[in-house]
């Protein structure tokens, strides 16, 4: 079995302020079992945007039904985009761990740019 890869096909996306951003991410394997998380930025100061396993993320919806059998699409939509949302977003696969899940592999990132609303 080939090792899982996290594919973020869009290097960048441009969204108008007030609109919804779609950030695409797919995994290439069902193995290992474990959730996906989305972050803005990299390194220790990265900001958690969405966690499949737990948490409340009112601006974020998933494109696919995560409970769908054999789902490997972890794309998200972020609503009501503002200039403060600009940055590089990473889709990160975790593998099931005990007691905590362990980061396994990250996508290459998608840069979100925000176009100001015309005044």
């Amino acid at each position: 079995e080939e090792e899982l890869q996290v594919i973020q096909p869009d290097k960048s996306v441009l969204v108008a302020a007030g609109e919804t951003a779609t950030l695409r991410c797919t995994a290439t394997s069902l193995i290992p079992v474990g959730p996906i998380q989305w972050f803005r930025g990299a390194g220790p100061g990265r900001e958690l945007i969405y966690n499949q396993k737990e948490g409340h993320f009112p601006r974020v919806t998933t494109v696919s039904d995560l409970t769908k059998r054999n789902n490997m699409d972890f794309s998200i939509r972020i609503g009501n985009i503002t200039p403060a949302d600009a940055g590089t977003y990473y889709c990160v696969k975790f593998r099931k761990g005990s007691p905590d899940d362990v980061e396994f592999k990250s996508g290459a990132g998608t840069e979100l740019s925000v176009r100001a609303k015309p005044s």
Epitope: E1, L30, I31, V33, G34, Q52, K53, E54, G55, D65, L66, T67, K68, R69, N70, N71, K96
Partner: antibody
Framework: QVQLVQSGAEVKKPGASVKVSCKAS????????INWVRQAPGQGLEWIAM????????HYNQIFKDRATLTTDTSTSTAYMELRSLRSDDTAVYYC????????????WGRGTLVTVSS | DIVLTQSPDSLAVSLGERATINCRAS??????????IFWYQQKPGQPPKLLIY???NLDSGVPDRFSGSGSGTDFTLTISSLQAEDVAVYYC????????FGQGTKLEIK
């Protein structure tokens, strides 16, 4: 971490119904399937049914389709399994189990609820 | 429905020796390159514990003396060097369609 806490032991008369609960914590309840499995004394495991808490989609073992009903309460992250028209051979430990990979498997288990059916 | 048949029903193995449990499906449990077989360990008075998923992948925290193999209809759980704490009943389960379990194999120390 993931925890599934089940309701206490029950003693029921033949012909009665029982409703077993399974309270989930440590994860987003609506993102993962819940399975129900039973085990009669000294016997093997028997899959009853599964439910997707996000939309209440259910799949039943044909053997239980007419007597078992699965429900969830997303406000309390609790899953329920009701079994009707109880018979003595329904005496068993009833387990709930969470499917962490949408593979129709059982990654995390409750401790079980003993249901005794006796006149 | 796919029926899973485990063999043997019971097995006694010396400490440090290899234990092998088989699981045969009545039809293929493979789909899209994956083998939908899972192995569980159950000790007395406890719920089952997932050991192996998708035929050959060790679950988190499971010692690497456990391994799974096979494809199509024939699958094997192997414990390379039996430890006292491995005494339990072992079950295979498929999810090619709706889940079913094998009847279980009781593993004891010789």
């Amino acid at each position: 971490q993931v925890q599934l806490v089940q309701s206490g032991a029950e003693v029921k008369k033949p012909g009665a119904s029982v409703k077993v609960s399974c309270k989930a914590s440590g994860y987003t309840f609506t993102n993962y399937w819940i399975n129900w499995v039973r085990q009669a004394p000294g016997q093997g495991l028997e899959w009853i049914a599964m439910i997707d808490p996000s939309d209440s989609e259910t799949h039943y073992n044909q053997i239980f389709k007419d007597r078992a009903t699965l429900t969830t309460d997303t406000s309390t992250s609790t899953a329920y399994m009701e079994l009707r028209s109880l018979r003595s051979d329904d005496t068993a430990v009833y387990y709930c189990a969470m499917d962490y990979g949408s593979l129709y498997a059982m990654d995390y288990w409750g401790r079980g609820t003993l249901v005794t059916v006796s006149s | 429905d796919i029926v899973l048949t485990q063999s043997p029903d019971s097995l006694a193995v010396s400490l440090g020796e290899r234990a092998t449990i088989n699981c045969r499906a009545s039809k293929s449990v493979s789909s899209s390159g994956y083998n939908y077989i899972f192995w569980y360990q159950q000790k007395p008075g406890q719920p089952p514990k997932l050991l192996i998923y998708l035929a050959s992948n060790l679950d988190s925290g499971v010692p690497d003396r456990f391994s799974g193999s096979g494809s199509g209809t024939d699958f094997t759980l192997t414990i390379s060097s039996l430890q006292a704490e491995d005494v339990a009943v072992y079950y295979c389960q498929h999810s090619r369609d709706l889940p079913t379990f094998g009847q279980g194999t009781k593993l004891e120390i010789k």
